[in-house]
Interface confidence: low
């Protein structure tokens, strides 16, 4: 076995101390170049020149409309994203030297992807369908068929199914049944009902009259008992809120075909919403 003199061993140690082994890994926010660890450029700055034995890493701030969002050794900054208005895009958040511009879609449009590089128009729900969920910047309109008792007569990206008008609460009757696309058509109480109700009223009055006549005849007969006091016929009060004499808030009548139709008070006549670009 070859033995090295003690001074050689010591000399070797000394050399190692003066000239350390080139690093194979660098600390966080550093990078290895030419066997040296150089500092990375901070976000918002780009690399101009690597460090040397004698100089630090040289960095320069990104220009206007440029950014770098990480500690880096990039020689070029990235361009801010352009929110192209013709693609329906607008700036949601302006970019800085450290962050990219964030685009979103104009109202009435939604992003085609998570990156939101372009937009398409929101889908409209056709008549017979209502909006279950209004579209957002990233999701399309969700439509649902109008269930029984509800309708939608427009193509819209915003309107839900509307409930049919309740004719009864307006002291009106259903003249035409509703569908998923049309509202119920209400109208005043029809003549048929009047033709049934009037004879009944007259019948009741006639019966009352007969009873009164019969009572009078009975009263005229001589009896041993004390005579009954004379009974006056009772006054009959007819309510003044019979169908047709509604004193509630006025309703506007319009002609529907040849039938007068009532537009429910407080309910607008609805027309299609013109979808935005």
């Amino acid at each position: 076995m070859v033995r090295l003199p003690l001074q050689c061993v010591l000399w070797g140690c000394l050399l190692t101390a003066v000239h350390p082994e080139p690093p194979t890994a660098c600390r966080e926010k550093q990078y290895l170049i030419n066997s040296q660890c150089c500092s990375l450029c901070q976000p918002g700055q780009k690399l101009v020149s690597d460090c040397t034995e004698f100089t630090e890493t040289e960095c320069l701030p990104c220009g206007e409309s440029e950014f770098l969002d990480t500690w880096n050794r990039e020689t070029h900054c990235h361009q801010h994203k352009y929110c192209d208005p013709n693609l329906g895009l607008r700036v949601q958040q302006k970019g800085t030297s450290e962050t990219d511009t964030i685009c979103t879609c104009e109202e009435g449009w939604h992003c085609t992807s998570e990156a939101c590089e372009s937009c398409v128009l929101h889908r409209s729900c056709s008549p017979g369908f209502g909006v279950k969920q209004i579209a957002t910047g990233v999701s399309d309109t969700i439509c649902e068929p109008c269930p029984v008792g509800f309708f939608s007569n427009v193509s819209s990206a915003f309107e839900k199914c509307h409930p049919w008008t309740s004719c009864e609460t307006k002291d009106l009757v259903v003249q035409q049944a509703g569908t998923n696309k049309t509202d119920v058509v209400c109208g005043p109480q029809d003549r048929l009902r009047a033709l049934v109700v009037i004879p009944i009223i007259f019948g009741i009055l006639f019966a009352i009259l007969l009873v009164l006549v019969f009572i009078k005849k009975v009263a005229k007969k001589p009896t041993n008992k004390a005579p009954h006091p004379k009974q006056e016929p009772q006054e009959i009060n007819f309510p003044d809120d019979l169908p047709g004499s509604n004193t509630a808030a006025p309703v506007q009548e319009t002609l529907h075909g040849c039938q007068p139709v009532t537009q429910e008070d407080g309910k607008e006549s609805r027309i299609s919403v013109q979808e935005r670009q």
Epitope: Q79, Y82, D84, S118, V120, L121, E275, R276, Q277
Partner: antibody, heavy 117, light 107 residues
């Protein structure tokens, strides 16, 4: 797949009008702008105008504003470009082109309009 | 209107050559520039949009770069099927305008 099919070639007299059609298929017609671009023989491309078929909103190049009308029929997914007061320099191939996710990604095959007396 | 000045108007190169076309906008258009290829009797085809994004199905030999007013279109290795006229177009603001075109031929 997306297709834009244009009407056939036309020969017109100066002063008259021409109406070129562009039938779209393979995508939601109302979701994308439709544009018209023309190219005179041996010349470059010139944008004429655009329409949003969903609301019929159109926009024109000032150069053609007084003579061009762009319309769209949603029921047939067809866009139309009408150019009036034709002159010999209007002899060109007229293209419809769809703009959406990318600019002018889809083009019609072109319609040659010849203006000659 | 934004003018797009394209150069050269024509060029001749050998198969395998690197071909570069430039386009200068009359004002800042950010990165809103597209490049099209047009062969005789055919409609233009989109190759590049937003200055550097290759459109679906476009071979990797086609690339674009630039921002602001100066833009470059490159064919890294010219192929016989690349013989065509190439146009730049700004998609920054209306009216959408095109460059005058560059006719590429094989030597």
């Amino acid at each position: 797949q997306v297709q834009l099919v244009q009407s056939g070639a036309e020969v017109k007299k100066p002063g008259s009008s021409v109406k070129v059609s562009c039938k779209a298929s393979g995508y939601a017609f109302t979701s994308y702008w439709m544009h018209w671009v023309r190219q005179a023989p041996g010349q470059g491309l010139e944008w004429m105008g655009q329409i949003n078929p969903s609301n019929a909103r159109s926009q024109y190049n000032e150069k053609f504003k007084t003579r061009v009308t762009i319309t769209a029929d949603k029921s047939t997914s067809t866009a139309y470009m009408e150019l009036s007061s034709l002159r010999s320099e209007d002899t060109a191939v007229y293209y419809c082109a769809r703009w959406g996710l990318q600019p002018f990604a889809y083009w019609g095959q072109g319609t040659l309009v010849t203006v000659s007396s | 209107d934004i003018q797009m000045t394209q150069s050269p108007s024509s060029l001749s190169a050998s198969v395998g050559d690197r071909v570069t076309i430039t386009c200068k906008a009359s004002q800042d258009v950010s990165t809103a520039v597209a490049w099209y290829q047009q062969k005789p009797g055919k409609a233009p085809k989109l190759l590049i949009y937003s200055a550097s994004y290759r459109y679906t199905g476009v071979p990797s030999r086609f690339s674009g770069s630039g921002s602001g007013t100066d833009f470059t279109f490159t064919i890294s290795s010219l192929q016989p099927e690349d013989i065509a006229t190439y146009y730049c177009q700004q998609h920054y603001s209306t009216p959408w305008t095109f460059g005058g075109g560059t006719k590429v031929e094989i030597k």
